[in-house]
Structure formats: C-alpha cells, structure tokens
Amino acid sequence: NYQNGKNNVPRLKLSYKEMLESNNVITFNGLANSSSYHTFLLDEERSRLYVGAKDHIFSFDLVNIKDFQKIVWPVSYTRRDECKWAGKDILKECANFIKVLKAYNQTHLYACGTGAFHPICTYIEIGHHPEDNIFKLENSHFENGRGKSPYDPKLLTASLLIDGELYSGTAADFMGRDFAIFRTLGHHHPIRTEQHDSRWLNDPKFISAHLISESDNPEDDKVYFFFRENAIDGEHSGKATHARIGQICKNDFGGHRSLVNKWTTFLKARLICSVPGPNGIDTHFDELQDVFLMNFKDPKNPVVYGVFTTSSNIFKGSAVCMYSMSDVRRVFLGPYAHRDGPNYQWVPYQGRVPYPRPGTCPSKTFGGFDSTKDLPDDVITFARSHPAMYNPVFPMNNRPIVIKTDVNYQFTQIVVDRVDAEDGQYDVMFIGTDVGTVLKVVSIPKETWYDLEEVLLEEMTVFREPTAISAMELSTKQQQLYIGSTAGVAQLPLHRCDIYGKACAECCLARDPYCAWDGSACSRYFPTAKRRTRRQDIRNGDPLTHCSDLHHDNHHGHSPEERIIYGVENSSTFLECSPKSQRALVYWQFQRRNEERKEEIRVDDHIIRTDQGLLLRSLQQKDSGNYLCHAVEHGFIQTLLKVTLEVIDTEHLEELLHKDDDGDGSKTKEMSNSMTPSQKVWYRDFMQLINHPNLNTMDEFCEQVWKRDRKQRRQRPGHTPGNSNKWKHLQENKKGRNRRTHEFERAPRSV
C-alpha cells in the first residue's frame, strides 16, 4: 500500500551544513569568554533581541543577529574568590549568569544575574527610540537579586515584570532549597508563597509566568506560573513529577494576621498530558519543559501550548499538549484537594468552602472585598491549608497533538505562529530539541477542529554541534525564529518555500501553510494577494486536485533524471535514488529492453532495497534494462529517476581490460568502436571500480584516477575533456549520497 506515506518523519531534514549553504540560518557562535545564551527578551518595536548570557547581555538586530551590541557585566574578583572558596566551580558557577531580562519601562530594562552565588540586579538603559542606539548598564544602581534570580545557574527561573513589580519563581537561598514565587520591586513589602510547606511548592522547577486577564476589570488580573514539581506524598505511589499551573491575583497583598506578606490567592492544579494505553494505564508526559501562550483575538482566553517529556529513563518520549483557559478556570473553580493527615489519601474537599471563595481576587466583580488584608480569617486559614485543586487540567481533545517516542532526542522549547492559509488558519509549531534541532510542525484539523493531525514539515539542525535548545522567540514582524543554547544564538526564517521543490505538486505536498504555488515557484503565501494562480491545500495536501492542470506543462515540468550505468556480469551494482521528501515511499519498476511492459521490483536475495536505492547482486544479462525509481506521497506518484543498466558479460570485459591504454589493436566489440583513446582509459578504470570487492577503497581509487587524469592533461594539451567530465559527474554523485535533499531537480508526473 503506497497511499500512506511516513507521516511521523519530517518531510525535509536539513543538516546544519545544508542550512548554511542555502542561507537559511545565521548563527552567532558565542564569545570565547561567555556561554549560556538562555535568557531572551524580544522587542519588536525596536527590532532587537536582548539576550542574557554568562557575564554578558547582548542586543541583537532582528534583521541579522550578526549585528549586535554587548554589555559586559562580570562579578568582582573578590566575589568570584568567595564563590570558589565555597566549593563552587570557577567556570560553570562563579560568574554572573543572567537569569532575568525584562522591560522595566519605555527607556530601561531590568536585569538580574546569579552574581557568582550572590544574586544581583540592575537597570539597562535602552533609550526612548530605536534610533537613539543606547545600550548601557546603570552602574550606579545595583540591587539585591535575592528572590529574583537564583544563586545557582543550573536552576530555572520564571519571571514577569508588570507595573514596576517583578513576579518570579525561583530559589531564594544559597543551597537552592527555599523555592518560592515572589513579588518584589515596587513600593510594597515583598510577597511570597508559604515557607516550609510542601503542599504549596515541592522542589519546583519553574518554567514561565504570564499575566492573563480574567474579566474587563483589571482588578481581576491573575498571574499564572507554569512549573513542574515533585508529587506530594499520597498523590502518587513512589517518587513522581507533576506538571503544574499556579495562579495568584495581581492585587494580592497578603493577609492581615495569618499569611502576612504571603500570597492569599495562590492555587495550583496539575496539568495532564498523557496518551491512553492498554489496560487503562496511560503513558504520562509529566516533565513540563516549556510553555507558549497563543494570544489570538481574546487576550482573556489564550491557547496554552505545553512541551512535556517523560520522567522515565527507560522510555524516552516527548509530547505537545494544548490547553484552554476555560478548562483551567473550571478546575480552579472546582473542588480543592484535601487530606486529613499525612497517611491519608487526597480527596475532594466536601465541607463548607468559606466566602469569598479562596483564590478569588478582591474586586468589585466578585464580591465586596477591597483587599486581601480584609479577607476573613476562615478564608485565609482555608487558603493556607488548601493550595491545590483536586481535579487536573486535561488537554484539549484529551490527548497530545504531537508525540515523539521513537527518536534519540527530546523536546525542550516551543513557539507557535498562527498562519492564514487559503483554506483557513493553522498553528505552526516550532519545537526545539535537546540535540540542537528545530522541528516545524503544523496541526491540521481533520473532521473537527478538535481532532488534529500532526504534520512534521521540517527538521532543521541549527547549531554546528548537538546542543540543547534553551530559548526560542518568534518575530512575526520579521518572520524569523531566534534560538538560544549554551553555544550561541541562531536565526532562521519561518519559511523556506523554495526548498520544497520546483514543481506545483511538491509545493502542494509540503502542506506548509506559509507556502503556495504561484504559477512558477513555491513561494510565500499572502492571503491579501488576490491571485487566482495560488495553489495550496494544507488540509489534504492533494496535488492531484490542485496541480492537475500543470502536470503536463513542460514549461514548469522537469522530466526525471536519466542515467546509464554499466555493470559487469556476476558483480554487484548500486542504483542510487532517494527522494527529497523523507515522507515519500520509494518503489522501483523494471522494464526489459525493447519491452513496453513495466513490472514492480520485488526484493529477494538478488535485489536488496535500502533507503539510498537498490543493490543488485551477482548481475546477469537478464538484469539489463530500464529501472524506474518512483516516489509516492499522499497518493501522488513522481518518477524521480530512470536508470538504464547495461550488463557486460565477462568475456567482453576481459577483452576490454587487456587492451593497451593508447587504444592500439583491433576492436571486435561494437561498444568500443565509438570510444576515443582517453575514454577507453576511463572505461577500463570504471569497470575496475564497479567490480571492486572493497567499496571502502572507492575514494582512494577515484583519487588515483583523478591524479592520473590531471597528469595526462598537463602532458597532452589537445586531449579530449570527455573523461574528466564523466569522472566529475561520478565524483558529484558520490558526494551526493549523503545529501538527500537537493539531489535532483525533478518534476512530478501524474499517476
């Protein structure tokens, strides 16, 4: 069955070399005295990407990250020595790793770093306007960074700066044990989550923080924290990790008698991302790695995209789950988790819930309390004892939209772009991995909007060495993606339409919402452009319908590549053919000489099929003929290559190989009559090459031939160039074996 392609593999797989060669990646490979380019702040208005790293803060031009400014912000020698004396690593820990980088106001950024295990913060002046070209550290104004940045650079921090107040989830101590969600800066006393209470936070790893409006009244605004933490005893048998969403009211100022300077509105719920399994046992992806909020039209209801991995060391997998804020709110309005003692199970709280309901923001909308300090004691007492909700938040459609379990990498980051296509809107996900690759995935609705099909468009290697992607930002203005890792920063366009191919069908099969066939090329699709020639079908990727009128248009069509190969009787030969699309299935047909009929090749001991092509062993005369390589994708058939194989019998070969190099002596075989002397040398070499028992020496053999060819060229000024051209072609083909993507320009053919 050739109808179903390999949907779980990327259609295009581009190596770092290919990305560079096709001008599809710009990389900043870091400074010798810096690393850890993990903290990103995108400023679309100024067209800058601010990046916090080790001892440095960078300001990159969004158009081209090769153009950048930098601030050096190291720690003092004294501070570094103190850190070293405390037993910390001088290179990996005793430096200023920037963990917080936020817009403070119109003219300044706020930045915090680990300060060699002594967190420190300051302000960075960026000026009023982009043309001011200001980027400098306010040296006179350093602040204590505790509760803002962790001490340990290995620890994650989630932060959000709004209205001059910094919300941050971090570790507030040297040992990295006192984790809390803080609110600092501003004019109020700092506020934090309850200390020494694992029910509130249990060794959390903070991912991100977001402000989401609850109503049109800003008093109801909430800050949501995404994190993962150890499951509380009784929640799970054995040690387990749970993904969480936590909420706090922006106008929470703590309690009056109890929970003084502590959050009174903190609640958390579990985020489930799992696949139903046999016997009712689900496969859980519990290790939340990253979160992206897709704001579209209604800022009160963004779609939450979460990247998860499995906790197990044996079974490695990754998934992307989508959540709706209405589902999140429903859980926070549901039952609280309750248990009567450490040896009891968690149950939904059945008793009377005090008024106003814990977790509700004090506002005119939901009751008459002006401040959390006015909340009744029973509300505060209840809130302190019941920070967790009983019900979890399930993903939309109750399952992940992307799952990867059969690969040697795990997901680390995600950004999402909503793209207008001919047949609707699509969310295109860019997923970063721990090996430095970016996956471009589109989720396509099938029968219903909830029932989504994942289509993996591209897998791109964006760093020279495999390195975990730790930060990603997407600029809709520039249509570029920015990627951070320990090694550096990379920039790549959101779309590479021309890379899909030179034909309508290839463009259509790609199912990339950014791209459409414009009548002459695969190019960026703009919904505003009123051109009837635009061909695009994201939902079905059906070129038969959308490109049928172009199939026989020789102006745009390219006939398949044709090759002639000579093989020696009883030896082996390899017919190379690999499609540009990894999702295509290849099948071969054989056509005997002087016959119209084509038969599909069946593999046996004589014929071995590989991803790169066909290996024919122990060649016989009957193997002579035409070999046609076809690619099938989404029901569409393309002929990629036509190879004519000529099998030479052994006697004929012996005769050829025993002739002198200068071509003297009579030729009894018809094949040799048309050859020039130099071509005979080439032919002898070629026969030796294809019949050589050790393919590993092929490169050495070719090298010798090229050397001899150059020597002959110097000796004979009037030689025929035919042989060197043929060898050049062979050399290119040899190189091309490892380059699957740009191998041939070929046109699709209709079925």
Partner: antibody, heavy 123, light 111 residues
Framework: EVQLLESGGGLVQPGGSLRLSCAAS????????MNWVRQAPGKGLEWVSG????????DYADSVKGRFTISRDNSKNTLYLQMNSLRAEDTAVYYC????????????????WGQGTLVTVSS | QSVLTQPPSVSGAPGQRVTISCTGS?????????VHWYQQLPGTAPKLLIY???NRPSGVPDRFSGSKSGTSASLAITGLQAEDEADYYC???????????FGGGTKLTVL
C-alpha cells in the same frame, strides 16, 4: 500580649529522657513557625529545632538529630520537645521562640522568646 | 566554634559609641541573607533588637542601629547607657543544616 512559657526541665541522668512543653498565648499560635533554642551555661545561643505551622516542615541541628523530636498541638497552643538519649553536653537552658519573619527577605528571626527551662544532664 | 564570629567583649563609657562586628561567610551573611541582633540582659531571655540588618522592632530605642556589607554585619550603639550592659548575639539564616546560625556573643561592658 505574646507570651511563651516553657516547662518540663529538670535533672536527668545521661541516657535518660525528658519532655519539654511551651504554652503559647496572645497570638494565633497555629499560624506561626516555632523553634527551640538552647544556651549552655556561660555559652552562646544554639538553634536546636524548628517546626512549621502545620508540622509539614521539621528540622533539627545535627547535634540532636535522631535523639530529639519536636511536635506541636495547635488545638492546645502548645509546642513540645521530646528529648531521648540525653548527654552531658545537652545541659542548657532551653528556650521556646517564635519565628517572626519580620525582614524583607523572610529570613527567620526570633521575635518572641520564653523565659527558658533548665535541663541538667548529670549522673 | 560559632559559624558567625563576634568579638568576645567590647566596652565603652556612658554616652560613648560602640560597635560590635559579626563576620560570616559566602554561604550565610555573604549570600545576601539578613542579619538579626539580640540583646540578652543578665539572667533573662534574649530579646530581638534589630531585624533584617537595620530595622528596629517597636520599643527599641533609636540609639541601636544595624548595618550589613558583604560577609559582615555590625551593631552600633550610640549614647551608651548603663542598662545597655548585656550580651549581644548576631544571627543569620543558613538553611539547611543548620537552619539558622548564631554568633558566639559579645559581652558589652559599660565602664
């Protein structure tokens, strides 16, 4: 007015046990973290043990770990310290102290102290 | 041996100014943790004198002030009075093992 009143001290032989109590009044006992701090005769202060408002967090100084047990009964507004396998070096005045967290950074201070109870370990 | 180092004794005449130092390390005071000071009058329980490096609880005279810099903190007493004769202890968070640390104490003698 905040008051902390320790009791239960006395003379005990090495290897013996003792249970100290601290009765709290004048504040919402169930909302506060509580501690035991001791002072050997003529010596400085040493933190012994701490317990969170709901007993979810309990910690001990290395010198008493495995021998002392801190607990509380919020319904009785009382803090306890069960001392087993007592040694001569445990001889001290034992103070009950409330964690105030008065500072900006929530670093524990001890804003109220009891008058102390003397524990003498001697044969 | 206390984790925080204080001078064993200081002295001063009435009306004078004295300071008591408290030196820690990068894993307590130097880590940015707050320093608190206690006064222990002879035969009584300690009393919180300064919290959060420099803040005075209500009822503590403004003659007492605290400061912190790097891995050290200090307590200053101006206009020394006879009733100030006591033992003074500094304390910082260390978390965990031990949870909090005290200085060895400084005996202030008013001459």
């Amino acid at each position: 007015e905040v008051q902390l009143l320790e009791s239960g001290g006395g003379l005990v032989q090495p290897g013996g046990s003792l249970r100290l109590s601290c009765a709290a009044s004048g504040f919402d006992f169930s909302s506060y973290e509580m501690n035991w701090v001791r002072q050997a005769p003529g010596k400085g202060l040493e933190w012994v043990s701490g317990i969170s408002w709901n007993s979810g967090w309990i910690d001990y100084a290395d010198s008493v770990k495995g021998r002392f047990t801190i607990s509380r009964d919020n319904s009785k507004n009382t803090l306890y310290l069960q001392m087993n396998s007592l040694r001569a070096e445990d001889t001290a005045v034992y103070y009950c102290a409330r964690s105030g967290y008065s500072s900006s950074w929530f670093d524990p201070d001890f804003d109220y102290w009891g008058q102390g109870t003397l524990v003498t370990v001697s044969s | 041996q206390s984790v925080l180092t204080q001078p064993p004794s200081v002295s001063g005449a009435p009306g004078q100014r004295v300071t008591i130092s408290c030196t820690g390390s990068s894993s307590n005071i130097g880590a940015g943790y707050d320093v608190h000071w206690y006064q222990q009058l002879p035969g009584t329980a300690p009393k919180l004198l300064i919290y959060g490096n420099s803040n005075r609880p209500s009822g503590v005279p403004d003659r007492f002030s605290g400061s912190k810099s790097g891995t050290s903190a200090s307590l200053a007493i101006t206009g020394l009075q006879a009733e100030d004769e006591a033992d003074y202890y500094c304390q910082s968070y260390a978390g965990p093992n031990p949870y909090v640390v005290f200085g060895g104490g400084t005996k202030l003698t008013v001459l």
